[in-house]
Interface confidence: low
């Protein structure tokens, strides 16, 4: 399916609006520090060029690859060396090395100010004054902060963002209409970004075999009535889509995602009975809907797995003939029967099954050797079941904030070398698993909890890879994708860690504490808690609780005082001294 001009092909397939949006996202994800106006200028130049190629595919440079065209355009940025340092060296390379170089310089934690939400009236005025610029600014600000955001999905978020303003800026109470919608988009956006980051990490760090295994398990749970061949086709197509998006090939990715949605809607009968309501929607909404679709009902008459995978005398023959296909079929069959298992658990079971066959098919009596393979699965299944049960009980007992604090203490003791902001961010997100999953029925708890934890722990791995400080974290992050969560769960107090020297500055607070939002206050307190644990890793729960209760009382007292700053100056050192004494 070759085209004389790739850029013309994609422009025609996607249409001008989506083409421009995706190019803006691509450029913003690569050059995260560039000002908005610079990116808009580059996008307009690329778009004008694409239009000349649509008019005449044989025109000069129209035959160049998209990487060449986009890379050449990025390398025209005058301040590349001053703004990005060594990333400018990418421009001396030829494709495909140049694009690889740009990808390697994507920054998961860019030094950008947090987005401040202006007053509703200010936003509505900006929206009405120039809707196109307003929406481009949204794409730009999200893309530069989330360099792996799933680009076609970001277009869907932008469409929802536009719809929210179009509706609410005309409402009687604009704020009451708009703010909950923006909060929802923000939270969903962060979740979407983190989920996509795990997909990209899976592809980039563990290869497409790892991603395909994940996709087989997840799609088999979603579409248990589909044949293995159908699931395999969807997995192949989905892998291509995500490989492209994770590789910065956003136009190809969006185009292929649209093709996949079209295929699924044309073949609903052989995939799932749940697709119907998605397929009536417009493209962006349709693709989103298909990605989030609920699991179809399991066929009633599924036979036992043991016949084909344990009792059969042909197991080793079938395995030897096509290992990956045989294991893929095993994973498919197991997953479609177990929507109650997390994808990561299903992948561990497939891995255990593979290890057993590797060992047993070389033994004197293979059948005797692998006859009890399903019994070996029991501890693997019970471990996440018990973990979810214990943590949901703890969450219900403590509530979200204190549950987060328990996790902060737990993880700081495991990996005290990790930076405090990272420990706070990751532990707060780990703690959100309670509200997200513990209210669900038993059959949905494990897939919700463990697969969410995998996403959050991937964030820890991604941040740690940028600045490696802990061999334990490196080990858990690199050894096995499917065993990351059990690896972190199994970590104990780091006995080799030399406690951090006490720094009174870390525990010095000011009157500005009082004007912070509830969330910001929590983050301040949790930051202090992590620093306490780094100072006294062997402190007991009771000691830490005592100090944190005193801290809350001290802040509350000073925020009620007439001279708040004087109170903090006077009471602060007393709190520090009392805390040191309590932890001695």
């Amino acid at each position: 399916d070759t085209h004389k001009s790739e850029v013309a092909h994609r422009f025609k397939d996607l249409g001008e609006e989506h083409f421009k949006g995706l190019v803006l996202v691509a450029f913003s994800q690569y050059l995260q520090q560039c000002p908005f106006e610079e990116h808009v200028k580059l996008v307009n130049e690329v778009t004008e060029f694409a239009k000349t190629c649509v008019a005449d595919e044989s025109a000069e440079n129209c035959d160049k690859s998209l990487h060449t065209l986009f890379g050449d355009k990025l390398c025209t940025v005058a301040t590349l060396r001053e703004t990005y340092g060594e990333m400018a060296d990418c421009c001396a390379k030829q494709e495909p090395e140049r694009n690889e170089c740009f990808l390697q310089h994507k920054d998961d934690n860019p030094n950008l100010p947090p987005l401040v939400r202006p007053e509703v009236d200010v936003m509505c005025t900006a929206f009405h004054d120039n809707e196109a610029t307003f929406l481009k600014k949204y794409l730009y600000e999200v893309a530069r902060r989330h360099p792996y955001f799933y680009a076609p999905e970001l277009l869907f978020f932008a469409a929802r963002y536009k719809a929210a303003f179009a509706e609410c800026c005309q409402a009687a109470d604009k704020a009451a209409c708009l703010l909950p919608k923006l909060d929802e988009l923000r939270d969903e956006g962060k979740a979407s970004s983190a989920k996509q980051r795990l997909k990209c990490a899976s592809l980039q760090k563990f290869g497409d075999r790892a991603f395909k295994a994940w996709a087989v398990a997840r799609l088999s749970q979603k579409f248990p009535k589909a044949e293995f061949a159908e699931v395999s086709k969807l997995v192949t197509d989905l892998t291509k889509v995500h490989t492209e998006c994770c590789h910065g090939d956003l136009l190809e990715c969006a185009d292929d995602r649209a093709d996949l949605a079209k295929y699924m809607c044309e073949n609903q009968d052989s995939i799932s009975s749940k697709l119907k309501e998605c397929c009536d929607k417009p493209l962006l909404e349709k693709s989103h809907c298909l990605a989030e679709v609920e699991n179809d009902e399991m066929p009633a008459d599924l036979p036992s797995l043991a016949a084909d995978y344990v009792e059969s005398k042909d197991v080793c023959k079938n395995y030897a003939e096509a290992k990956d296909v045989f294991l893929g079929m095993f994973l498919y069959e197991y997953a479609r029967r177990h929507p109650d298992y997390s994808v990561m658990l299903l992948l561990r079971l497939a891995k255990a099954y593979e290890a057993t066959l590797e060992k047993c098919c070389a033994a004197a009596d293979p059948h005797e050797c692998y006859a009890k393979v399903f019994d070996e699965f029991q501890p693997l299944v019970e471990e996440p079941q018990n973990l979810v049960k214990q943590n949901c009980e703890l969450f219900e007992q403590l509530g979200e904030y204190k549950f987060q604090n328990a996790l902060l203490v737990r993880y700081t003791k495991k990996v005290p070398q990790v930076s405090t902001p990272t420990l706070v961010e990751v532990s707060r997100n780990l703690g959100k698993v309670g509200a997200k999953c513990c209210k669900l029925p038993e059959a949905k708890r494990m897939p919700c909890a463990e697969d969410y934890l995998s996403v959050v722990l991937n964030r820890l791995c991604v941040l740690h890879e940028k600045t490696p400080v802990s061999e334990k974290v490196t080990k858990c992050c690199t050894e096995s994708l499917v065993n990351r969560r059990p690896c972190f769960s199994a970590l104990e107090l780091d006995e080799a860690y030399v406690p951090k020297a006490f720094n009174a500055e870390t525990f010095t607070f000011h009157a500005d504490m009082c004007t912070l939002s509830e969330k910001e206050k929590q983050v301040k307190k949790q930051t202090a808690l992590v620093e306490l644990v780094k100072h006294k890793p062997k402190a007991t729960k009771e000691q830490l609780k005592g100090v944190m209760d005193n801290f809350a009382a001290f802040v509350e007292k000073c925020c009620k005082a007439d001279d708040k700053e004087a109170c903090f100056a006077e009471e602060g050192p007393k709190f520090v001294a009392a805390s040191q004494a309590a932890l001695a």
């Epitope: 390379k93 090395e97 690889e100 170089c101 390697q104 563990f206 490696p468 400080v469 690199t478 050894e479």
Partner: nanobody, 115 residues
């Protein structure tokens, strides 16, 4: 499990050369940047050199620039450090590490430069 096994160290005269190797297993070697770190007697670990996952981007500490060359063979899952024009102050235990960390987790290989 992640394993890094260094070899190639030894006793060499000033001005001489050595080639260190680090055999990796238990992780997707080709996906990670790697570094060499050294620790002289009585001193803390010192980062020496780093290489990106594909082998295109290499970095060196000022003290070894122009004398040491880092390289890798992803097919063999092996990291190398070619050390030329060795000086007595290069005497140390050399470790390979994942990422650009100055911490050490393997056994290391002793390099002694002395006449």
């Amino acid at each position: 499990e992640v394993q890094l096994v260094e070899s190639g160290g030894g006793l060499v005269q000033p001005g001489g050369s050595l080639r260190l190797s680090c055999a990796a297993s238990g992780f997707t070697f080709g996906s990670f940047g790697m570094s060499w770190v050294r620790q002289a007697p009585g001193k803390g670990p010192e980062w020496v050199s780093a290489i990106d996952s594909g082998g295109a981007d290499t970095r060196y500490a000022e003290s070894v620039k122009g004398r040491f060359t880092i390289s890798r063979d992803n097919a063999k899952k092996t990291l190398y450090l070619q050390m030329n024009s060795l000086k007595p102050e290069d005497t140390a235990v050399y470790y390979c590490t994942i990422g650009r960390s100055a911490s050490r987790g393997s056994q290391g290989t002793q390099v002694t430069v002395s006449s």
